[in-house]
């Protein structure tokens, strides 16, 4: 706590500008007006203070605004957000996405802090919904963000705003993730035309059910082995030789290499070996000609 | 190019004065606060004084004040250090330095230094 | 404020994970910037704010810490990289540098 001293003569601010540059943490204390401050923090970000100094004018803030800073203060924070805790932020009231761009501009290139997560937790419940504006914006400072996500708070994310995501925003997503984007993503992408479809929906495909990829499969799409690898292992279970060849057109060679990963290696062991050898890429663990296959979950599901 | 280029250095009798410069280029100088840092031969590295953008404030290490003063002039781009009653302690390599320009009181464009020597 | 760097040098060869500290004599939040100067070269920016990685420095160099302690990292040394490694905190005035470490070829 800094003590309460007079202010020198002289020395009493009228601007926030670099003539405080210097000043000792008491000078700023007893020569700074709060409401000042609050008016002109914008300048701040253009002054080399040390962080003893910063401690001095976020307090001052902190007394102004016992219960949280305003729109207008907060927008002009620069890199003094740096120094809130996400408990002063939990505090804030921020609806307006020029100052989410803002405050986020400041820690761009860092992992997400606790006090961004903060933020954005605080945007996103202030605005009722990830719309397509918030979620451009988040997943262009943050690739990750949407992957943070879990599937309850993705079940928000309407349909229109999946047009802003890009396939890196992907990488980090669970399938239980997925299987709540998929759907958005099939609603979404609806109208186009096969190709182009297909390059939309590819990066969601983790969440698809075996009747999509069955359906896929007669376009020509000729799937890729990642995006092969990250479907779900129950959706290609079913799926025929002749599907599977058909999904992935030329990339089927790749089943070799994959061979004893999932799902490839899980649904070789439900193919019959004649079918599997059909495919001229020595693949062994299917199903010896002659024997029955009994599909016992199906059996249950009738009974 | 975003440069910094000191002159100025050379021998002095303990008790001399030197005037060291500092030539900046390729950005807006008077933005900029702007440092002098001291390295001993074999040392590491001192703090000795900063200036503010328009040169209203000034600082100065405990080791310095009184004897150094730190100037610049934004019309000619231009950091200045004069330097008077000279030890033989104040022998070093003296770097100006620039302000970061994020907030914090980091230094982020070095010159490549000027030797000053003390001795008699 | 007083930085304390360990060791003051080190050998190491091309590839070796390097570590160096910085401990402060007071708390300093993340207050601290690292640079690396060469011989006869100006000292370097490769760090601030403890963990901010400076434009056009390479990834192999990292920070962290926070308070009293901090560290700087190279993943896997080049040999552009045997220099001398300096700790700045800019917390208070006076702005003080530690040491030095002086990374050498084994």
């Known amino acids: 706590e800094v003590e309460k001293t007079a202010c020198p003569s002289g020395k009493k601010a009228r601007e926030i500008d670099e003539s405080l540059i210097f000043y000792k943490k008491w000078e700023l204390e007893a020569c700074v007006d709060a409401a000042l401050l609050a008016t002109q923090m914008d300048r701040v970000n253009a002054i080399p203070f040390t962080y003893e100094q910063l401690d001095v004018l976020k307090h001052k803030l902190d007394e102004l605004y016992p219960q949280g800073y305003p729109e207008s203060v907060i927008q002009h924070l620069g890199y003094l957000f740096l120094k809130m805790s996400p408990e002063d932020i939990r505090k804030w009231n921020v609806t307006s996405l020029e100052t989410l761009k803002a405050l986020l501009e400041v820690n761009k290139g860092h992992e997400m802090s606790p006090q961004v997560a903060t933020l954005i937790d605080r945007f996103v419940k202030g605005r009722g919904q990830l719309d397509k504006d918030t979620l451009d914006t988040l997943t262009a400072f943050y690739p990750g963000y949407l992957c943070s996500l879990s599937p309850e708070e993705l079940s928000s994310v309407p349909p229109s705003s999946i047009w802003a995501v890009r396939p890196q925003d992907l990488d980090t997503c669970d399938p239980r993730q997925l299987d709540v984007l998929y759907p958005k993503a099939r609603l979404a992408f609806q109208n186009m035309n096969g190709s182009e479809y297909f390059v939309k929906i590819q990066s969601f495909l983790g969440g698809a059910p075996t009747e999509d990829l069955k359906a896929l499969s007669q376009q020509n799409v000729s799937m890729d082995l990642a995006t092969f690898m990250k479907l779900r292992t129950d959706a290609v279970l079913p799926l025929t030789v002749a599907e599977v060849q058909k999904l992935l057109g030329p990339h089927v060679e790749g089943l070799k290499a994959e061979e004893r990963h999932r799902p490839v290696r899980d649904w070789i062991l439900r193919q019959r070996q004649d079918d599997l050898d059909t495919l001229g890429l020595g693949l062994q663990g299917g199903i010896p000609n002659g024997y029955l296959v009994l599909d016992l979950s199906m059996q249950e599901a009738l009974s | 190019e975003v440069q910094l280029l000191e002159s100025g250095g050379g021998l002095v009798q303990p008790g001399g004065s030197l005037r060291l410069s500092c030539a900046a280029s390729g950005f807006t100088f008077s933005s900029y606060a702007m440092s002098w840092v001291r390295q001993a031969p074999g040392k590491g590295l001192e703090w000795v004084s900063a200036?503010?953008?328009?040169?209203?404030?000034?600082y100065y290490a405990d080791s310095v004040k009184g004897r150094f003063t730190i100037s610049r002039d934004n019309s000619k781009n231009t950091l200045y250090l004069q330097m008077n009653s000279l030890r033989a302690e104040d022998t070093a390599v003296y770097y100006c330095a620039k302000w970061g320009g994020r907030l914090y009181w980091y230094f982020d464009l070095w010159g490549r230094g000027t030797l000053v020597t003390v001795s008699s | 404020i007083q930085l304390t760097q360990s060791p003051s040098s080190l050998s190491a060869s091309v590839g070796d994970r390097v570590t160096i500290t910085c401990r402060a004599s007071q708390g300093i939040s993340s207050a601290l910037a690292w640079y690396q100067q060469k011989p006869g070269k100006a000292p370097k920016l490769l760090i601030y704010d403890a963990s901010s990685l400076e434009s056009g420095v390479p990834s192999r160099f990292s920070g962290s810490g926070s308070g009293t302690d901090f560290t700087l990292t190279i993943s896997s040394l080049q040999p552009e990289d045997f220099a001398t490694y300096y700790c700045?905190?800019?917390?208070?005035?006076?702005?003080?540098f530690g040491g030095g470490t002086k990374v050498e070829i084994k």
């Open positions: 700045q905190q800019f917390n208070n005035y006076p702005l003080t």
């Open positions: 200036i503010s953008g328009s040169g209203g404030s000034t």
